[in-house]
Amino acid sequence: GSERTCCPVNWVEHERSCYWFSRSGKAWADADNYCRLEDAHLVVVTSWEEQKFVQHHIGPVNTWMGLHDQNGPWKWVDGTDYETGFKNWRPEQPDDWYGHGLGGGEDCAHFTDDGRWNDDVCQRPYRWVCETELDKASQEPPLL
């Protein structure tokens, strides 16, 4: 596999990761697929410092992150442990609210206008952030 040593054009480098900030919205799954096709993933927030960095770039706009509970427990898309990891939920969130009338609960996490997190309907077309780590060997399959 190859290693990414610098960030692609239009991406922002921070603490050995590259970040890309959308300026339009997509449903969570479509945003997730976009990131994957860029050899990245929806942003995984592992520290207060990273939270502040992302918050600074997105401003007061609802923005998807790589956290969901569509299969039961809350999971980060890159496998980072949710239970022991950084969290920044709004008070009384996540609440898996069913009162929105769109069917089902709320299974995808996003940054709210103040940066704290909320769970919401995954189909809402919010902005999103992709992240990829520098110096990480790519997933390119070995040549046979």
Epitope: P8, N10, S22, R23, K26, A27, L37, D39, E140
Partner: antibody
Framework: EVQLLESGGGLVQPGGSLRLSCAAS????????MSWVRQAPGRGLEWVSA????????FYADSVKGRFTISRDNSKNTLYLQMNSLRAEDTAVYYC?????????????????WGQGTLATVSS | DIQMTQSPSSVSASIGDRVTITCRAS??????LAWYQQKPGKAPKLLIY???SLQSGVPSRFSGSGSGTDFTLTISSLQPEDFATYCC?????????FGQGTKVEFN
């Protein structure tokens, strides 16, 4: 200059296999996602499959899932489409296309360069 | 899957005419739409992306508009090299899907 050159098309019987190749030049191949798009005779375009720059993430249309495999060899600047269990309805010109060279960072993957296509005919 | 429906399927026009082609998505796709031009026996060529952004090198007589589900491609003054088939494509979600195409023919 960006160039994409497909090959590997031909006549095959139903149930048979073909392997299409797309040789690329003029850009840093491993940095860009790529797709296969097909066009049946006299019909519209149909997206078939996409692959990320590293080859680590792949996506397929339901019509080919489980039968077709997209892959790439970044050391050879070549994209592949392995087509198995072929059906008459797979008969088409197959184009390889690249995403994001001229149109980067928009939040969507558009097909901004295309090859000239290779014809795969499935018939008994 | 998101269905993309173009109208008309063909249009007859003359040099200098203003030509308008519409594309409707079966679901909301924001502005994640592209327009392509294809000539017989040739590969498609990207004209417009993100509904209204003109691809580099494409003449300014081509323009795109719309968002949500309804989109339009306009050729402000048809030129001889513009006789071709035009199709739209949604890039909102997998599977990416195309319209069936609109053929611009000489009147």
């Amino acid at each position: 200059e960006v160039q994409l050159l497909e090959s590997g098309g031909g006549l095959v019987q139903p149930g048979g296999s073909l392997r299409l190749s797309c040789a690329a030049s003029g850009f840093t191949f491993s940095s860009y996602a790529m797709s296969w798009v097909r066009q049946a005779p006299g019909r519209g375009l149909e997206w078939v499959s996409a692959i990320s720059g590293s080859g680590g993430n792949t996506f397929y249309a339901d019509s080919v899932k489980g039968r077709f495999t997209i892959s790439r060899d970044n050391s050879k600047n070549t994209l592949y489409l392995q087509m198995n269990s072929l059906r008459a309805e797979d008969t088409a010109v197959y184009y390889c296309a690249i995403h994001g060279i001229a149109v980067a960072g928009t939040g969507a993957h558009y097909f901004d360069y295309w090859g000239q296509g290779t014809l795969a005919t499935v018939s008994s | 899957d998101i269905q993309m429906t173009q109208s008309p399927s063909s249009v007859s026009a003359s040099i200098g005419d203003r030509v308008t082609i519409t594309c409707r998505a079966s679901q909301f796709i924001s502005s994640w739409l592209a327009w392509y031009q294809q000539k017989p026996g040739k590969a498609p060529k990207l004209l417009i992306y993100t509904a209204s952004s003109l691809q580099s090198g494409v003449p300014s007589r081509f323009s795109g508009s719309g968002s949500g589900t309804d989109f339009t491609l306009t050729i402000s003054s048809l030129q001889p090299e513009d006789f071709a088939t035009y199709c739209c494509q949604q890039a909102n979600s997998f599977p990416w899907t195309f319209g069936q195409g609109t053929k611009v023919e000489f009147n």
